[in-house]
Interface confidence: medium
């Protein structure tokens, strides 16, 4: 019979034969023959594989390192990683969660909706035309644009929702 | 190197005042928010207070406004926290911050205790 160019779901192929792969949890150890079938062995303690796979080492479960403020949200088991989160009143610096924060700072550009609690992070607001907020803060709100014509002054460069407007004195030479 | 550290800590009985002090060094302490957080024993991180560098803008946990004051001086690169009317839920390890970084930039902490 021709050799397999392709195999079914949960095989593969390897001298022109197909293969089982391993299961989630289990490492392989040798590719099928003719004769025999693949061999797998599960992972270590502290070790994991997600999917059907013919990988020769399991993946090492995370390390919610506590120096980062990380703690164990779900133990890993030998099919999933562990999944860590952090200490409480504490944030995630991203989806992976690899560092905490107290609170997330708001851009430039961005105001403090809602100083942080202990349970939700700071909300940011895009800073609306006529505010700026020119500093990365998990607490200042955006700020007015300074008005000029309270000051007798003309805007001299407008504002963005970074910047402050730029006063400056009025034309003399106008009636 | 960032080092941060707290002092003034103490015991106190209730309805008693301390205050505290961080002394910041290895960063330009007036481009920075500070804040103070607290542990209380068997408890997680709380957020207690912060103040803008240039010490105009100030932040208080609803636990303790009112009662605790944050100020800063940039002249001597220290930040303090005026406590008073002090209770027994205020007792805790208080730590100061350097802006609002990761878990790095914290000093070792002053331990408050409120107890009669």
């Known amino acids: 019979p021709e050799p397999p160019t392709a195999c079914r779901e949960k095989q593969y192929l390897i001298n022109s034969q197909c293969c089982s792969l391993c299961q989630p949890g289990q490492k392989l150890v040798s590719d099928c023959t003719e004769f025999t079938e693949t061999e797998c062995l599960p992972c270590g303690e502290s070790e994991f594989l997600d999917t059907w796979n013919r990988e020769t080492h399991c993946h090492q479960h995370k390390y919610c390192d506590p120096n980062l403020g990380l703690r164990v949200q779900q133990k890993g088991t030998s099919e999933t990683d562990t999944i860590c989160t952090c200490e409480e009143g504490w944030h995630c610096t991203s989806e992976a969660c690899e560092s905490c924060v107290l609170h997330r700072s708001c851009s430039p550009g961005f105001g403090v909706k809602q100083i942080a609690t202990g349970v939700s992070d700071t909300i940011c607001e895009p800073c609306p035309v006529g505010f700026f907020s020119n500093v990365s803060s998990a607490f200042e709100k955006c700020h007015p644009w300074t008005s000029c014509e309270t000051k007798d002054l003309v805007v001299q460069q407008a504002g963005t929702n970074k910047t402050d407007v730029v006063c400056g004195p009025q034309d003399r030479l106008r009636a | 190197e960032v080092q941060l550290l707290e002092s003034g800590g103490g015991l106190v009985q209730p309805g008693g005042s301390l205050r505290l002090s961080c002394a910041a060094s290895?960063?330009?302490?007036?481009?920075?928010?500070m804040q103070w957080v607290r542990r209380a024993p068997g408890k997680g991180l709380e957020w207690v207070s912060a103040?803008?560098?240039?010490?105009?803008?100030?932040y208080y946990a609803d636990s303790v406004k009112g009662r605790f004051t944050i100020s800063r001086d940039n002249s001597k690169n220290t930040l303090y926290l005026q406590m008073n009317s002090l209770r027994a839920e205020d007792t805790a390890v208080y730590y100061c911050?350097?802006?609002?970084?990761?878990?790095?930039?914290w000093g070792r902490g002053t331990l408050v205790t409120v107890s009669s």
């Open positions: 290895g960063f330009t302490f007036e481009w920075y928010e």
């Open positions: 911050a350097k802006g609002l970084e990761y878990f790095d930039y």
């Open positions: 103040i803008s560098g240039d010490g105009y803008r100030t």
